[in-house]
């Protein structure tokens, strides 16, 4: 059966910083999350099965002024998809999204969401991973921030 | 044959008002509005064949100062894709994206985007339809506001 | 087997200016860029096979204050994929995205990313376009800026 | 719950002019949509002019356009009315109003309002 995976953020582990970081937690089964014919492992989706894949994610951000003050209003908030190859250790990324905001502390609420989607030939034991920056800006609902893949064709 | 449906906004009945509202009027036949195995009805897409389908939509909104002088320059522009049961009354929501903006009077116009998708369970006789805030700044063009769904693969 | 292209912008060529251009060098066999049953001829993704294709696009902007001044700080950044029928010549827009944005020289490095996508019928013949404004600011890299296609079912 | 309060009403002869002010307290200021209304002896409250929560966008009644200018300073909590090329017909109870953004557009009739100030008197005379 054609592999795919739906995976939600699971936002109890979520790192803090502003940095790009790679986020580790998601869920693959609970809810609106999925995983068939593909392996969700130490935060990475593993490919299972040789394949042609539309990729994609939708990443959100908010903060509301109750949350406390920001460091910086000039906010790069951004996503990258990666493939990591373990035979030959290597990161690349597929697809990468986003946009610099000015949130300022004139408005109360701030909300930005950002989907990016591609098709990519995959490889058994190539893995997905997803990274973010400003990730303490993450909106945790599984509606809003998650990635998946699914198989569309067999490699020729 | 496999379902599919692509819908674009019906323009001329398109509510007002800043707050949610679930868009009702879609075309389903004329331009590159389709539907296969699908059907339209009452605002809603309903689903007739189990499956694992894509869901995707496309919003834009847009305002030029001919059209009128905005109450707040402070905007939430969102999407909201939902799903709701019959069986069991209930409405999730599947997907979210937007955007907080700030569109000034200093401009004569202005643009915002929204793109959202995602890989989805859905039974027959679940229905999905498109909540947006701000439904009358919609661009009305087929090609901006717009959502759909193709079915990928069976239930196991 | 399955037509399907995945193109990555050709930096070598973009074009300046800041009005609305068609984007006619990408890559298609290189890094992310492949293609199969489909064609790549001036600047055009070609449909060799009639059928239902799920179209996607995701092109980046962005602007170094190193690279120069802005013209403005009031920017419209968009795409428009477009499709050209040849025996009825005649183009028409599938899909249209982006966002109107102010690109204060107060910041040294500004972003943004639209994305869409849909899914529509292609016959044997028709050409897929990408065109976009400000060219010029376009990020180069193949994660970045590139759309793409795939079949999903046949034309019943 | 806002409370308004306006000032600077009084006489003034045809082709002069005034400056109301509407002083907010209660509520953030920064949130409301205000509003200038106006009600001449005999006849119905009238839109004369509103203001975005940021104050960049202004919407008149044909009537005043060009004469009247709508601000605010959202520092101050207060919004202001200056009005030029003063009318006899200008003549009436000045209302200032406030309401929360519920549409998209500048809202211009009476029931879109959810607080007034208890008016202050123009009188232009000829």
């Known amino acids: 059966a054609q592999p795919f995976a739906h995976l939600t953020i699971n936002a109890t582990n979520i790192p803090t910083g502003s940095h790009k970081v790679s986020l580790s937690s998601w869920y693959h089964d609970r809810g609106w999350a999925k995983i068939s014919n593909m392996t969700f492992s130490n935060g990475k989706l593993i490919v299972n099965q040789d394949g042609f894949y539309y990729l994609y994610a939708n990443i959100c951000f908010r903060h509301h002024e109750t949350s406390g003050d920001l460091a910086t209003e000039y906010l790069q908030l951004m996503v990258y998809v990666t493939k990591t190859s373990i035979k030959i250790p290597s990161s690349h990324t597929l697809m990468k999204g986003g946009s610099t905001k000015y949130w300022s502390g004139n408005s109360e609420f701030h909300f930005y969401s950002i989907n990016v989607g591609g098709f990519f030939k995959l490889r058994s034991g190539e893995e997905i991973s997803v990274e973010v920056s400003n990730p303490s800006l993450l909106d945790p609902d599984q509606d809003a921030t998650y990635f998946g893949a699914f198989k569309v064709r067999d490699i020729d | 044959a496999q379902p599919f449906a692509h819908l674009t906004i019906n323009a001329t009945n398109i509510p007002t008002g800043s707050h949610k509202v679930s868009l009702s009027s879609w075309y389903h036949d004329r331009g590159w509005a389709k539907i296969s195995n699908m059907t339209f009805s009452n605002g809603k897409l309903i689903v007739n064949q189990d499956g694992f389908y894509y869901l995707y939509a496309n919003i834009c909104f847009r305002h030029h100062e001919t059209s009128g002088d905005l109450a707040t320059e402070y905007l939430q522009l969102m999407v909201y894709v939902t799903k709701t049961s019959i069986k069991i009354p209930s409405s999730h929501t599947l997907m979210k994206g937007g955007s907080t903006k700030y569109w000034s009077g200093n401009s004569e116009f202005h643009f915002y985007s929204i793109n959202v998708g995602g890989f989805f369970k859905l039974r027959s006789g679940e229905e999905i339809s498109v909540e947006v805030s701000n439904p009358s700044l919609l661009d009305p063009d087929q090609d901006a506001t717009y959502f759909g769904a193709f079915k990928v693969r069976d239930i196991d | 087997a399955q037509p399907f292209a995945h193109l990555t912008i050709n930096a070598t060529n973009i074009p300046t200016g800041s009005h609305k251009v068609s984007l006619s060098s990408w890559y298609h066999d290189r890094g992310w860029a492949k293609i199969s049953n489909m064609t790549f001829s001036n600047g055009k993704l070609i449909v060799n096979q009639d059928g239902f294709y799920y179209l996607y696009a995701n092109i980046c902007f962005r602007h170094h204050e190193t690279s120069g001044d802005l013209a403005t700080e009031y920017l419209q950044l968009m795409v428009y994929v477009t499709k050209t029928s040849i025996k009825i010549p005649s183009s028409h827009t599938l899909m249209k995205g982006g966002s109107t944005k102010y690109w204060s020289g107060n910041s040294e490095f500004h972003f943004y990313s639209i994305n869409v996508g849909g899914f529509f019928k292609l016959r044997s013949g028709e050409e897929i376009s990408v065109e976009v404004s400000n060219p010029s600011l376009l990020d180069p890299d193949q994660d970045a800026t590139y759309f793409g296609a795939f079949k999903v079912r046949d034309i019943d | 719950e806002v409370q308004l309060v306006e000032s600077g009403g009084g006489l003034v002869q045809a082709g002069g002019s005034l400056r109301l002010s509407c002083a907010a307290a209660?509520?953030?200021?920064?949130?409301?949509?205000m509003g200038w209304f106006r009600q001449a002896p005999g006849k119905e409250r009238e839109f004369v002019t509103a203001?975005?929560?940021?104050?960049?966008?202004?919407g008149y009644v044909d009537s005043v356009k060009d004469r009247f200018t709508i601000s605010r300073d959202n520092t101050k909590n207060t919004v202001y009315l200056q009005m030029a090329s003063l009318k006899p017909e200008d003549t009436a109870v000045y209302y200032c109003?406030?309401?929360?953004?519920?549409?998209?557009?500048?809202?211009?009739?009476?029931?879109?309002?959810?607080?007034w100030g208890q008016g202050t008197q123009v009188t232009v005379s000829s």
């Open positions: 109003a406030a309401t929360t953004p519920a549409t998209t557009y500048l809202p211009r009739s009476e029931r879109q309002y959810d607080y």
């Open positions: 209660g509520g953030t200021f920064r949130n409301y949509v």
């Open positions: 203001i975005s929560t940021g104050g960049s966008w202004t």
